[in-house]
Interface confidence: low
């Protein structure tokens, strides 16, 4: 006959490990007892349990409550045992010694590897600002046994660098994602993907990028100067910019205070019926925590009477 076992048994931390040891013998052969021992213990073999065909299972004090037989139905030739609630310290080599009649004794060794699934964490880097050079966007750390893999899933262009720290029977892996911040990255997802044999599926942690920026400011509303004439109602100037964080707007007049009746409503400057007093240089001041921008425009309110008078003068002059 021969013993059937596995070269390597893999179990996830906290789960039960089945240590297989099955005697495949000729008909009529019997298994008297199966002795399980930790084969790589410091001071020789450390006994786990003795499985006797007549007296049942005896577990050594060091493993009391942790070694059981698999649930029924049981094959009398099966010397497999369950090691409950596997911990990293259980990693190593185990030996089963099977005493059979009449064939004698057989022994087999297996290696138990305890997988420790990682619990990844993602740490955002310092605040991202447009105009910076290569900057840390985020780092992702995962510790497990064996060493987990940490990768990044993103549409954002960047570079990754990884380092790992090995401990006893485990490793901590940290991957960093660096990028050159630009406004197009704002709101884009950056996902840390952690792979490990102890995980049923990859673990993913997503970080939304926030890049501080402030676009150039511009003013809309003066596209058709002929509309800015005395008496016109509903005239307005709108300041255009965008930023992260969203900017605030402030309007001033360069050549004096804002005329009475002119309303400031955020990015919009609203005028009452126009008079020539509304002519002047207006400044839109845009700012956020990152930066500030200015845009100025010259408003020239046309007085049709003045214009026609000038035209008459011009005609008579000719």
């Amino acid at each position: 006959g021969e013993l059937e076992t596995s070269d390597v048994v893999t179990v996830v931390l906290g789960q039960d490990a089945k240590l297989p040891c099955f005697y495949r013998g000729d008909s009529g052969e019997q298994v008297g007892q199966v002795a399980w021992a930790r084969a790589d213990a410091g001071e020789g073999a450390q006994e786990l349990a003795l499985l006797h065909s007549k007296y049942g299972l005896h577990v050594s004090p060091a493993y009391e409550g942790r070694v059981e037989q698999p649930p029924p139905p049981r094959n009398p030739l099966d010397g497999s045992v369950l090691l409950r609630n596997a911990v990293q310290a259980d990693e190593g080599e185990y030996e089963c010694r099977v005493s059979t009649f009449p064939a004698g004794s057989f022994q087999a060794r297996l290696r138990l590897r305890v997988l420790v699934p990682p619990l990844p964490s993602l740490n955002p880097g310092p605040a991202l600002e447009e105009g910076q050079g290569l900057t840390l966007a985020a780092s992702c750390t995962a510790e497990g046994s064996p060493a987990p893999s940490v990768t990044w899933d993103t549409e954002v262009k960047g570079t990754t660098s990884s380092r790992s720290f090995k401990h006893s029977r485990s490793a901590a892996v940290t991957s960093e994602f660096h990028l050159v911040p630009s406004r197009s990255m704002n709101g884009q997802p950056l996902t840390c993907v952690v792979s490990h044999p102890g995980l049923l599926q990859d673990q993913r942690i997503t970080h939304i990028l926030h890049v501080s920026f402030l676009a150039e400011a511009s003013v809309r509303g003066l596209e058709d100067q002929n509309l800015w004439h005395v008496g016109r109602e509903g005239a307005m100037l709108k300041c255009l910019s965008e930023g992260q964080p969203p900017p605030s707007y402030n309007w001033t007049r360069l050549d004096g205070p804002l005329p009475s009746g002119v309303r400031v409503d955020g990015d919009t400057l609203g005028f009452p019926p126009l008079t020539t007093e509304h002519s002047g240089i207006y400044v839109c001041h845009v700012s956020n925590e990152f930066s500030s921008r200015d845009s100025q425009v010259t408003v020239d309110v046309l007085d049709p009477q003045e214009d026609s008078g000038k035209q008459v003068d011009l005609v008579s002059a000719s």
Epitope: S6, D7, V8, T10, R113, L115, P146, S149, T151, S162, S164, K166, V193, S195, H196, P197, G198, L199, L200, Q201, D202
Partner: antibody, heavy 116, light 108 residues
Framework: QVQLVQSGAEVKKPGASVKVSCKAS????????IHWVRQAPGQGLEWMGW????????NYAQKFQGRVTMTRDTSISTAYMELSRLRSDDTAVYYC?????????WGQGTLVTVSS | EIVLTQSPGTLSLSPGERATLSCRTS???????LAWYQQKPGQAPRLLIY???NRATGIPDRFSGSGSGTDFTLTISRLEPEDFAVYYC?????????FGQGTKVEIK
Amino acid sequence: QVQLVQSGAEVKKPGASVKVSCKASGYTFTGYYIHWVRQAPGQGLEWMGWINPNSGGTNYAQKFQGRVTMTRDTSISTAYMELSRLRSDDTAVYYCAREDWDFDYWGQGTLVTVSS
Amino acid sequence: EIVLTQSPGTLSLSPGERATLSCRTSQSVSSSYLAWYQQKPGQAPRLLIYGASNRATGIPDRFSGSGSGTDFTLTISRLEPEDFAVYYCQQYGSSPITFGQGTKVEIK
């Protein structure tokens, strides 16, 4: 006993693709990463990448990014490596290997010949 | 990437002699992540040593590994006829995984 059995030799034309299989037996397929390593005639060993059979997660060597795809089918305990846009310098023996930190078991290798 | 440099490229020895193979890494490698493989013509590589100094299952004790940092050594205390082959070192602690170019141990 642990075995990694690979598919047979292939002859391909430049520009074509090849898909090599690696069937695992004798162990829990989803418990170990599978790596792919190639060896050009008379040359050394070159790592191509890995797949985590449990999750399907992959990691490819920079050199093969965009040309290599590693997949698996857990129902039949088989890993696959597909290399596209083949060139003559892709002629090599392709090995799968099981990772237990080190590569403790290897497939027998699959010779891929790229020739016009 | 970490470059592994093996020396000598070829080692010509007689059976019974001692073989000493060197593997130098361009950056320090934890000894836990260095392995040695043996490859015979037409065969797949076979794991000899893992963790720099641990013999794999079924490997005779004439094979031993040592070293740390950037210098690692594989020693075959007394060469047997079946030991003439190509030997590769490998680091598997840093991505990408890399191999040395190999040392051929041939019969003198």
